[in-house]
């Protein structure tokens, strides 16, 4: 069913990292335009990206209202230049997305090592607490603010002169590790949400090594 000469969207896909969330779909439109609606299970559908020829729609502003809710989006197809036209059933053609729960499914972005500081045989490594687009009381929350203790970081570290890696974990954004005096070490971190069943881990951060500008050394 549906409007003559329009085709339904397909391959509706959520692309989400640190709650920045975009819905993508196919096909590239030929003589048609799209409007997207999004809703929680309440069925209070909100329209976005009106009559667009794009095949993506940024839904971040909607999902950050409550990242624990489960969302569904639907993409309506209309004939270009005649968006009031409907199909034989009096309904425009549409397709539903998969369900999407941001808290459980948004990808964890690549973390960044903010700094490291050596004091004797200990090194304190700090992970940057990235800001998200989730708001509370008119302020943007950090990744740690949103996930709390559900979010851990894994530190991989190794002597610059060898390849044997060690690991450490923290449920804050800081590590305090023991190192051999006089040795330079390299570091990489990964964000992990162990309780998740999908998208549990981020990609590894860029490697940072002692003796470079991010570090500080004190006896």
């Amino acid at each position: 069913s549906g409007t003559t000469n329009t085709v339904a969207a397909y391959n509706l896909t959520w692309k989400s990292t640190n709650f920045k969330t975009i819905l993508e779909w196919e096909p590239k439109p030929v003589n048609q335009v799209y409007t997207v609606q999004i809703s929680t299970k309440s069925g209070d559908w909100k329209s976005k990206c009106f009559y667009t020829t794009d095949t993506e729609c940024d839904l971040t502003d909607e999902i950050v209202k409550d990242v624990n809710q489960t969302y569904l989006a639907r993409v309506f197809s209309y004939p270009a230049g005649n968006v009031e036209s409907t199909g034989s059933a009096g309904e425009p053609l549409y397709e539903n997305s998969p369900e999407f729960t941001p808290y459980l499914e948004t990808n964890l972005g690549q973390p960044t090592i903010q700094s490291f500081e050596q004091v004797g045989t200990k090194v304190n490594v700090t992970v940057e607490d990235e800001r998200t687009l989730v708001r509370r009381n008119n302020t943007f929350l950090s990744l740690r603010d949103v996930f709390g203790k559900d979010l851990i970081y894994t530190l991989y570290y190794w002597k610059s002169s060898s390849s044997g890696k060690k690991t450490a974990k923290t449920n804050t954004n800081e590590f305090l590790i023991d190192v051999d005096k006089g040795e330079n070490y390299c570091f990489s971190v990964q964000a992990v949400i162990p309780s998740r069943t999908v998208n549990r881990k981020s990609t590894d951060s860029p490697v940072e090594c002692m003796g470079q500008e991010k570090g500080e050394f004190r006896e």
Partner: antibody, heavy 118, light 107 residues
Framework: EVQLLESGGGLVQPGGSLRLSCAAS????????MSWVRQAPGKGLEWVSS????????YYTDSVKGRFTISRDNSKNTLYLQMNSLRAEDTAVYYC???????????WGQGTLVTVSS | DIQMTQSPPSLSASAGDRVTITCRAS??????LAWYQQKPEKAPKSLIY???SLQSGVPSRFSGSGSGTDFTLTISSLQPEDFATYYC?????????FGQGTKLEIK
């Protein structure tokens, strides 16, 4: 555990009115669309009406438009169906159901019988 | 309105049998279809939504398939508690409509 408990059914004369209630518990009521579905004796299921979580959007089957009104009180976790100008063909068990996105019906009450007869 | 036609209207089978019930929509509804089970004097129970997604708590012997206009509900190995009436429902567009039901009886 999701629980839906209908009440307000009974015997009413043609042309009369009745108000059904559905008390919800075990979930965040305002987060879900809700629906009424009915089943005439010995017959199949018929969707009657749906309402969004905010109450801003309501939908009805053609045969009850203008006679039935669906509403909800989220502060009381209660769904309502005001039925006016009742007809013999409205006789049925009326079920309240939770309706994610206003789509399918994932949890149902036990039903309340409405009999329209003189 | 979209008409939903179920077949067969009734079906006799034995415990352990594999059973398939079909539902046809009068126009395309993509995957916007649900299946319900109802036992005598009881409220319906949700089995399947989005044509093939199993409702939480429903045994895996139940499965759904199809898209567009033709859909099936399959019970891979009938259990005694599965004898009931089954309904399909489209939620593509209002008014939502149900099939007339398929009564599954013990042979």
């Amino acid at each position: 555990e999701v629980q839906l408990l209908e009440s307000g059914g009974g015997l009413v004369q043609p042309g009369g009115s009745l108000r059904l209630s559905c008390a919800a518990s075990g979930f965040t009521f305002s987060n879900y669309a809700m629906s009424w579905v009915r089943q005439a004796p010995g017959k199949g299921l018929e969707w009657v009406s749906s309402i969004s979580g905010s109450g801003d959007y309501t939908y009805y089957t053609d045969s009850v438009k203008g006679r039935f009104t669906i509403s909800r009180d989220n502060s009381k976790n209660t769904l309502y169906l005001q039925m006016n100008s009742l007809r013999a063909e409205d006789t049925a068990v009326y079920y309240c159901a939770r309706s994610p996105w206003g789509y399918y019906l994932d949890s149902w009450g036990q039903g309340t019988l409405v009999t329209v007869s003189s | 309105d979209i008409q939903m036609t179920q077949s067969p209207p009734s079906l006799s089978a034995s415990a352990g049998d594999r059973v398939t019930i079909t539902c046809r929509a009068s126009q395309g509804i993509s995957s916007r279809l649900a299946w319900y089970q109802q036992k005598p004097e009881k409220a319906p129970k949700s089995l399947i939504y989005a044509a093939s997604s199993l409702q939480s708590g429903v045994p895996s012997r139940f499965s759904g398939s199809g898209s567009g206009t033709d859909f099936t509900l399959t019970i891979s190995s009938l259990q005694p508690e599965d004898f009931a009436t089954y309904y399909c429902q489209q939620y593509n567009s209002y008014p939502y409509t149900f099939g007339q039901g398929t009564k599954l009886e013990i042979k």
